[in-house]
Amino acid sequence: APISSHCRLDKSNFQQPYITNRTFMLAKEASLADNNTDVRLIGEKLFHGVSMSERCYLMKQVLNFTLEEVLFPQSDRFQPYMQEVVPFLARLSNRLSTCHIEGDDLHIQRNVQKLKDTVKKLGESGEIKAIGELDLLFMSLRNACI
């Protein structure tokens, strides 16, 4: 089971209208550049077999991957939203740095790895897709971690 006290974010993180709006605007703009509507990153396959109490830890993994492998490399695109949203998400990642789960997390890593593999396989269009799903990342973090 997760160490719940560390796998939590204060709901105030998700109640800031300005940065919430900027996150959704960034997702919307990137989605307009995403021509691959058949592939889903954040959805039922990601959560399959993961209990509700493990999902904040799961989303921490997705958030860290998205920051390091997608947002940082694409940081010059989708301005001015990117320069505001990346620091916000980085702060959330930092606040989840002590979020771990005890015991076997293989099933979680397997699901996250599938998402990573999909993004990598699609190359730059996979990165654009991940940015286009930042609204879902935001909602998933909020639903799982508050």
Epitope: F24, D34, D38, G43, E44, M52, G132, S140, N143
Partner: antibody, heavy 119, light 108 residues
């Protein structure tokens, strides 16, 4: 098999409250959000909100804020929706439905509970 | 604000193909789901994520997307397909699911 079974029909007076139950079976209750959706006679579907059975956390549609309360009892795998200060236009069939992520399709629905508000 | 637009009714002869559309502004990164509701019954999910079919739903039911329009296609229509059909997306900007107004499918 996976199912959601709701409580029976209710008749209420304006100003009263109603509490509808939704009993889950055939899956791990805590792993799916329970949503409430209502349908007025001859009308479309209207989302009211969800409860996270694991944490008890809720998210309500703005229209129902302050009037709706969604709860759950983990020990009996049951979710509840209470609507207060009932008006005649609250007459509807109330459905519970489950979803995996909080923003995914509703893959299983309860059979519905007719709530009639009449003086 | 987002609105999903469906035709109020569609009529089709048995054995033919029925197409029900769902239009919305800014559909692009939203997943479209379709529900069938027969009179006096609860809705049933028939298509999710634009084109995926839940187990138990006949292959005659399919979904597709083109730009800002999603389409539910029912091939070789049967009398038992007569029902109301609703499209749905999750609107992240308002953080709630949006339902179309519903389409009544009549089998002639």
């Amino acid at each position: 098999q996976v199912q959601l079974v709701q409580s029976g029909a209710e008749v209420k007076k304006p100003g009263a409250s109603v509490k509808v139950s939704c009993k889950a079976s055939g899956y791990t209750f805590s792993d799916y959000y329970i949503h409430w959706v209502r349908q007025a006679p001859g009308q479309g579907l209207e989302w009211m909100g969800w409860v996270n059975p694991d944490t008890g956390g809720t998210r309500y549609a703005q229209k129902f804020q302050g009037r709706v309360t969604m709860t759950r009892d983990m020990s009996i795998s049951t979710a509840y929706m209470e609507l207060s200060r009932l008006r005649s236009d609250d007459t509807a069939v109330y459905y519970c439905a489950r979803d995996l992520t909080g923003f995914d399709p509703f893959d299983i629905w309860g059979q519905g509970t007719l709530v009639t508000v009449s003086s | 604000s987002s609105v999903l637009t469906q035709p109020p009714s569609v009529s089709v002869a048995p054995g033919k193909t029925a197409r029900i559309t769902c239009g919305g502004n800014n559909f692009r990164n939203k997943r479209v789901h379709w529900y069938q509701q027969k009179p006096g019954q609860a809705p049933v999910l028939v298509i999710y994520y634009d084109s995926d079919r839940p187990s138990g739903i006949p292959e005659r039911f399919s979904g597709s997307r083109s730009g800002n329009t999603a389409t539910l296609t029912i091939s070789r229509v049967e009398a038992g397909d007569e029902a109301d059909y609703y499209c749905q997306v999750w609107d992240s900007s308002t953080d709630r699911p949006l339902f179309g107004g519903g389409t009544k499918l009549t089998v002639l």
